[in-house]
């Protein structure tokens, strides 16, 4: 017979013959023959191939490296890849999340307009008049200034964006 | 990780690099491209991610394109409208936005008329 | 456009000693950065990682400090082998990923 030219899904073309391709989570050892079939052997511990493949190697599970924020979401299987996220307080660099950075602070002068997600880094935004951050936080929102009238004080220091108003006693006066 | 051979090209020529990896998936890892002019810096050109998402430096946005094919497991980088200052030597390695362990040894690409 | 400034472009230091490269962000990017070692005719290898945690391999005589917008890398006990370009690379973001402009060090 005429050797084929294609094969079947999940079978591959070798030496002129089609020989079946291995499942997912084994690797192959040798391509069939004439008289035998192909030869797979299950992927090693902390090994994984997702796929019908006619690959000599396992690929190896990824590493969620501690030291770039990444933690373990699901442990791998021989059939599926460790699927990293990152620590509390830390966030993906890119959609594909192979690293991650810790959240940022708002500076003095800026507040949260936004906390921080796992996806999306803090947004800060500038304390308006009337409002203040003396603090670097991902967390505190710009305060207002203390109202010194309803605390029957003036103010005797104007507030900025970085402090807060300094309210004093009322000149009393002299009779 | 290893990239094809460069070699001499001309100006407005366009350049085709392949990477081809090993050892792990592209459905797993990025793979981004940097290069280094003689005697200069490294310079990130751009990458793709695991997911296939394709990130450029700013003043290669116009003209690279970073492609991948996960069953070759290899990524290819292409750059239009050469000029000498494109002379360099041009490495892959593991890793779409993040940092670099693995390295190709590097490509020398020449630009000249 | 985000930039990376590294100072200085070149450091000599005895053998033994200590040298300090800084590296810094035109705007925040966290803990995002990390440091190269580059010798002629090689690719870089990965020293530091998150500002300041040592890749796997590397000598604990490099150590990187800073956060935000200031980074440094220092290199004590300086030997032989340490002669080599520095580079700092930020992967905040992609629109942050950069290498700066590199740091050659000569030791004597």
């Known amino acids: 017979p005429e050797p084929p030219t294609a094969c079947r899904e999940k079978q591959y073309l070798i030496n002129s013959q089609c020989c079946s391709l291995c499942q997912p989570g084994q690797k192959l050892v040798s391509d069939c023959t004439e008289f035998t079939e192909t030869e797979c052997l299950p992927c090693g511990e902390s090994e994984f191939l997702d796929t019908w493949n006619r690959e000599t190697h396992c690929h190896q599970h990824k590493y969620c490296d501690p030291n770039l924020g990444l933690r373990v979401q699901q442990k791998g299987t021989s059939e599926t890849d460790t699927i990293c996220t990152c620590e509390e307080g830390w966030h993906c660099t890119s959609e594909a999340c192979e690293s991650c950075v810790l959240h940022r602070s708002c500076s003095p002068g800026f507040g949260v307009k936004q906390i921080a997600t796992g996806v999306s880094d803090t947004i800060c935004e500038p304390c308006p008049v009337g409002f203040f951050s003396n603090v670097s936080s991902a967390f505190e929102k710009c305060h207002p200034w203390t109202s010194c009238e309803t605390k029957d004080l003036v103010v005797q220091q104007a507030g900025t964006n970085k402090t807060d108003v300094v309210c004093g006693p009322q000149d009393r006066l002299r009779a | 990780v290893k990239e094809s051979e460069g070699g001499l090209f001309k100006p407005k020529d366009t350049l085709t690099l392949t990477c081809t990896v090993s050892?792990?998936?592209?459905?797993?890892?990025?793979v981004s491209w940097v290069r280094q002019a003689p005697g200069n810096g490294l310079e990130w050109i751009g990458g793709?991610?695991?997911?296939?998402?394709?990130y450029y430096a700013s003043w290669a946005k116009s003209r690279a394109t970073i492609t991948r094919d996960t069953n070759l497991k290899t990524v290819t980088l292409e750059m239009t409208s050469l000029t000498a200052a494109d002379t360099a030597t041009y490495f892959c390695?593991?890793?779409?936005?993040?940092?670099?362990?693995?390295w190709g040894p590097g490509t020398l690409v020449t630009v000249s008329s | 456009a985000f930039e990376l400034t590294q100072t200085p472009a070149s450091v000599e230091a005895a053998m033994g000693g200590t040298v300090t490269i800084k590296c810094q962000a035109s705007?925040?990017?966290?803990?995002?950065l990390a440091w190269y070692q580059q010798k002629p005719g090689q690719p870089p290898k990965l020293l530091i990682v998150?500002?300041?945690n040592l890749a796997s391999g590397v000598s604990s005589r490099f150590k990187g400090s800073g956060s935000g917008t200031e980074f440094t890398l220092s290199i004590s006990d300086l030997e032989c082998a340490d002669g080599a370009t520095y580079y700092c690379?930020?992967?905040?973001?992609?629109?942050?990923?950069?290498f700066g402009g590199g740091t050659e060090v000569v030791v004597k």
């Open positions: 690379q930020s992967y905040f973001s992609s629109s942050s990923t950069v």
């Open positions: 050892g792990f998936s592209l459905s797993s890892y990025g």
């Open positions: 705007q925040s990017i966290s803990n995002g």
């Open positions: 390695a593991r890793g779409g936005i993040t940092v670099y362990a693995m």
């Open positions: 793709i991610g695991s997911d296939g998402s394709a």
């Open positions: 998150g500002a300041s």
